[in-house]
Amino acid sequence: WDPVALKLPERNTPRNSHCHLSNSPRAIEHAYQYGGTANSRQEFEHLKGDFGAKSQFSIRLRTRSSHGMIFYVSDQEENDFMTLFLAHGRLVYMFNVGHKKLKIRSQEKYNDGLWHDVIFIRERSSGRLVIDGLRVLEESLPPTEATWKIKGPIYLGGVAPGKAVKNVQINSIYSFSGCLSNLQLNGASITSASQTFSVTPCFEGPMETGTYFSTEGGYVVLDESFNIGLKFEIAFEVRPRSSSGTLVHGHSVNGEYLNVHMKNGQVIVKVNNGIRDFSTSVTPKQSLCDGRWHRITVIRDSNVVQLDVDSEVNHVVGPLNPKPIDHREPVFVGGVPESLLTPRLAPSKPFTGCIRHFVIDGHPVSFSKAALVSGAVSINSCPAA
């Protein structure tokens, strides 16, 4: 399967008619939040305009991180590259000139939680870093005959696993935590990300611990040490901002699956154990969309499935599989790639809202150690209102 390429819309959508909380919490327009996972990022593939000889990038930045990647682009082998990152709270702009590296480092620290305008310019073997329109830092290296062969994507907020290690100090290759806005190349806005991993709108207002799944869609793929076999117990708390959406999905190559989702406020568990589909559901007396936290537990004991929603419970007994097979399979939380949905599993909306205290078989699951966070998912913080 391929991670779904998710784009973030620019306007807040209206309040969900069934939900106490708006499905788009208050956020800064055109600003996106990065961090929470090591490789939180947006990727921009097809850029208008060439930046071979001369380029001027500009961006707005707000962070409290001391270290982390803000911008990175390179050729395939990462011999030619350009990067902006944080080191000890200072901004570092770097690119190569032939085999040498030109590095410009700010004297001031900019991890003060305030917005800063940053312009980074490359003109062949010269570089300029302009911060807040006031401080201009400039460096040059002797020119070379080598041509600069940069190839997309531009990585914003972080890089793909394994990238940038060759050129950037280890504690700055991981995603920075904070917000970016208004990325421009040579005065033209760069808006449509081809892929998004753990990036949400830049929310305003109080935040609390949890993993937030934004309306734009996304999902978490759990680390492979977690898998759902013949017997398991999954428990988690949800505070939805929409009355429908995928909560948990596990799928094996031979078509067996577990799917937990909400549909119009009802929680449904569907299972296929290699014989046929079977399902159970709970319609809570208290709406899950009331702005409070609700606890959901799914227990599978071979062909018996139990669903608990708060204090309400239901069961289904499926057919016995005479030769049950225990698979290791990826577990998706908050959404599922469409390529994995079988005809029997109608395409389901991704979940919108917050999930916390996710536990499998008594072991707390850290989403920050997930195998993949795709789309508009904020790992460690949820808008509280």
């Epitope: 977690f226 898998n227 759902i228 076999g229 013949l230 017997k231 398991f232 117990e233 227990i299 004991d301 071979s302 062909n303 018996v304 139990q306 419970v313 239901n314 069961h315 289904v316 007994v317 016995l320 599989n321 049950p324 225990d326 698979h327 290791r328 499998i360 078989d361 008594g362 072991h363």
Partner: antibody, heavy 119, light 113 residues
Framework: QVQLQQPGAELVKPGASVKLSCKAS????????MHWVKQRPGQGPEWIGM????????NYNEKFKSKATLTVDKSSSTAYMQLSSLTSEDSAVYYC????????????WGQGTTLTVSS | DIVMTQSPSSLTVTAGEKVTMSCKSS????????????LTWYQQKPGQPPKVLIY???TRESGVPDRFTGSGSGTDFTLTISSVQAEDLAVYYC?????????FGAGTKLELK
């Protein structure tokens, strides 16, 4: 404390049916699965099936599907197992057993009802 | 159905002796998700229902003396009594707790010399 009360013995004729009872006390009856187990003298136990009093969900051992019918009466916190078309092969001790919860073991057993099928 | 095979069918021992009995299942009882083996050992004395000694193959039920130890994984399991006492004379059953239908072994009867 948890108690599962079962009649000590039942004597029935071949071909007849019998309804064995198991009255639960000392815990919330509707919260836990109740299982039934058969044990013939000198043999290992055999699992018949399980029922959840709240949802009414039942999971049978295929071997006993046409023999046993599990039901509950929530108002009296009693589980029942009806055995039909009795033969001498059905003569055994029948236990009702409470399960701690799904994925866990049996935590309480009744004392068992000795069923004798004889003319 | 998973078939549980116990051996030996009976054991004659003297007090203080170490005893081991075996239980084999026709399919693995190891759950890959939580890496637990769903095998339970019971002790049954005459006229009484079975009593849980060990669950998850090696976890001792509270109140069970530590001379009882469960071990093994997958399809091969062992119950060991480090020093048999007179009150340990009983029939010991292993049970597949992994998949339905739940199945029991035929038992190992522990007798005193």
């Amino acid at each position: 404390q948890v108690q599962l009360q079962q009649p000590g013995a039942e004597l029935v004729k071949p071909g007849a049916s019998v309804k064995l009872s198991c009255k639960a006390s000392g815990y919330t009856f509707t919260t836990y699965w109740m299982h039934w187990v058969k044990q013939r003298p000198g043999q290992g136990p055999e699992w018949i099936g399980m029922i959840h009093p709240y949802s009414g969900a039942i999971n049978y051992n295929e071997k006993f599907k046409s023999k046993a019918t599990l039901t509950v009466d929530k108002s009296s916190s009693t589980a029942y197992m009806q055995l039909s078309s009795l033969t001498s092969e059905d003569s055994a001790v029948y236990y009702c057993v409470k399960q701690l919860r799904l994925l866990y073991y049996f935590d309480y057993w009744g004392q068992g009802t000795t069923l004798t099928v004889s003319s | 159905d998973i078939v549980m095979t116990q051996s030996p069918s009976s054991l004659t021992v003297t007090a203080g002796e170490k005893v081991t009995m075996s239980c084999k299942s026709s399919q693995s009882l190891l759950n890959s998700g939580n890496q637990k083996n769903y095998l339970t050992w019971y002790q049954q004395k005459p006229g009484q229902p079975p009593k849980v000694l060990i669950y998850w193959a090696s976890t001792r039920e509270s109140g069970v003396p530590d001379r009882f130890t469960g071990s093994g994984s997958g399809t091969d399991f062992t119950l060991t009594i480090s020093s048999v006492q007179a009150e340990d004379l009983a029939v010991y059953y292993c049970q597949n707790d992994y998949s339905y239908p739940l199945t029991f072994g035929a038992g190992t009867k522990l007798e005193l010399k």
